[in-house]
Interface confidence: medium
């Protein structure tokens, strides 16, 4: 997520070709151009080993915990939830992520040596992450919103439903990262390094801003209102009802949203403004824009910590995780079976009860 | 930081020629557009001559035919070649690009900026 860099980008360079008068970055400014404030780009400044600590700190965790998190899921099939099968995919894509950082963090020191072919592969992995992520985060919202609110197993009964579900996700996620895909490319120059980064060429400014809107709205908002529909909804029935069992059993989904949210809201609402300044919603001033960059680096990072977190939610909050590994540990001989609770059953997730089925 | 760096003004007889060039330095990306201004004193700024990456080139009327824009793209460097100078021609003359940088610190963005060199001064007198 481009420019996301949605950096993303999340979509860097929307500036080239366009009228630049507004915003005139001048190293010396001549008595000319008094009215106008020096102004150079600007971005925090991180040592970059600091960086690549960080990104490997992240990487390690990331494999580890979603590796666990797949294999507690994949053990137990018996009692395999909906709910279960998204968060699985979940972990795939922190996983899928998370084996970019690696690349990401050699870019740091030598600059981007991996060739385009890479550069879109792992600029396209760290898009199809979010959008997948929230998309994922969605269903299991209108899954629960389902079971609690309706008291309907619909979704539940029909598990190739769910597996077409999840596919159509992985689909979508990739459509929305396309604009990534296109035009992120390695960019060799005499005064730096390679990069990797946003180069859309001459494309018309409406082109390249309806190419970021569109993955915004259908990759963010959209997914962000449904979350908020189907969750308000849920818990008003479990308030009313006074479900406590139930309740408690949505913890960790509740935790798992809230985590993404603290990590994906701060970056995609800087990069909402900063959409809103290309297309002169806000007006764009030097400060701003440098605010904007400055804003970009610092939200940025909660994004890609976001990729090591929900394992650690699982293993701090949820008991059937912490119980499915410890039954896999069990059974390979790692720990002895005496060490097992007594209520581990078999299912990673939860058990069903009436017509809904409890979360980890 | 990326810099503007000009050099070759002085003082000049009418009729004369001299040789402005301007180096741009630092961590660039793209330079799209390279040009020169000019500034009389007591006058507005206005266009001198301007190239584009892809070496088209724009001249203001009053220049065309004496003064020749070229630039060297592996160098990063713009450079006016100024023949048949004229009393009128006495100036700052400042170097102006359109120069792609790169920020970010977790993914590189690029961003597009306008930036001055401090000028050099041509005078042409008898």
């Known amino acids: 997520m481009e420019d996301f860099n949605m950096e993303s980008d999340s979509f860097e360079d929307f500036w080239k070709g366009e009228d630049l008068s507004n915003y005139s970055y001048s190293s010396t400014l001549p008595p000319f151009l008094l009215d106008a404030a020096p102004c150079e780009p600007e971005s925090l400044e991180i040592n970059k080993y600091f960086v690549v600590i960080i990104y490997a700190l992240v990487f390690l965790l990331s494999l580890l915990g979603n590796s666990l998190v797949m294999l507690v899921i994949l053990y137990s099939r018996v009692g395999r939830s909906v709910t279960d099968v998204y968060l699985l995919n979940l972990a795939l894509a922190d996983l899928l992520f998370a084996l970019t950082l690696p690349i990401w963090a050699a870019s740091k020191v030598n600059g981007w040596i991996f060739g385009t072919f890479l550069c879109k592969v792992v600029s396209l992995l760290k898009e199809v992450n979010f959008y997948s992520g929230i998309l994922l985060l969605a269903c299991i919202s209108v899954d629960r919103y389902l079971a609690i609110v309706h008291a309907t197993r619909t979704l539940t009964q029909k598990r190739y439903l769910v597996k077409f579900i999840c596919l159509s996700i992985w689909g979508l996620s990739l459509l929305l990262a396309l604009p990534v895909l296109l035009f992120r490319r390695t960019v060799y120059s005499s005064n730096v390094s390679p990069a990797c980064y946003e180069d859309m060429g001459n494309n018309t400014a409406n082109w390249r801003m309806l190419l970021r809107i569109l993955p915004q709205s259908f990759g963010f908002i959209v997914p962000l209102l449904i979350m908020l529909f189907c969750y308000g909804f849920t818990l008003r029935t479990l308030f009313k009802a006074h479900m406590g069992q139930k309740h408690r059993a949505m913890r960790v989904i509740f935790a798992v949203v809230l985590i993404f949210l603290l990590c994906w809201l701060p970056y995609n609402l800087v990069l909402l403004a900063d959409t809103l300044m290309r297309t002169q919603v806000i007006q764009e001033t030097c400060e701003r824009r440098n605010h904007i960059d400055r804003a970009l680096d610092a939200t940025e990072i909660l994004g890609i910590l976001h990729s090591c977190l929900n394992p650690l939610i699982y293993a701090f909050i949820g008991q059937k995780f912490r119980h499915g590994l410890l039954k896999i540990l069990a059974i390979h001989g790692l720990i002895s079976k005496d060490s097992l609770p007594k209520d581990s059953r078999p299912s990673f997730v939860g058990s069903s009860s009436g017509h809904t089925s409890t979360t980890l | 930081e990326v810099q503007l760096l000009e050099s070759g003004g002085g003082l000049v007889q009418p009729g004369g020629s001299l040789r402005l060039s301007c180096a741009a330095s630092g961590s660039i990306v793209r330079i799209n557009t390279m040009g020169w201004y000019r500034q009389a004193p007591g006058k507005q700024r206005e266009l001198v001559a301007d190239i584009t990456s892809g070496g088209n080139i724009n001249y203001a009327d009053s220049v065309k035919g004496r003064f020749t824009i070229s630039r060297d793209n592996s160098k990063n460097t713009v450079y006016l070649q100024m023949n048949s100078l004229r009393p009128e021609d006495t100036a700052v003359y400042y170097c102006?690009?359109?120069?792609?940088?790169?920020?970010?610190?977790?993914?590189?963005?690029?961003?597009?900026?306008?930036?001055w060199g401090q000028g050099t001064l041509v005078t042409v007198s008898s």
């Open positions: 102006n690009a359109e120069i792609v940088v790169l920020v970010g610190v977790w993914t590189q963005r690029a961003r597009t900026g306008n930036y």
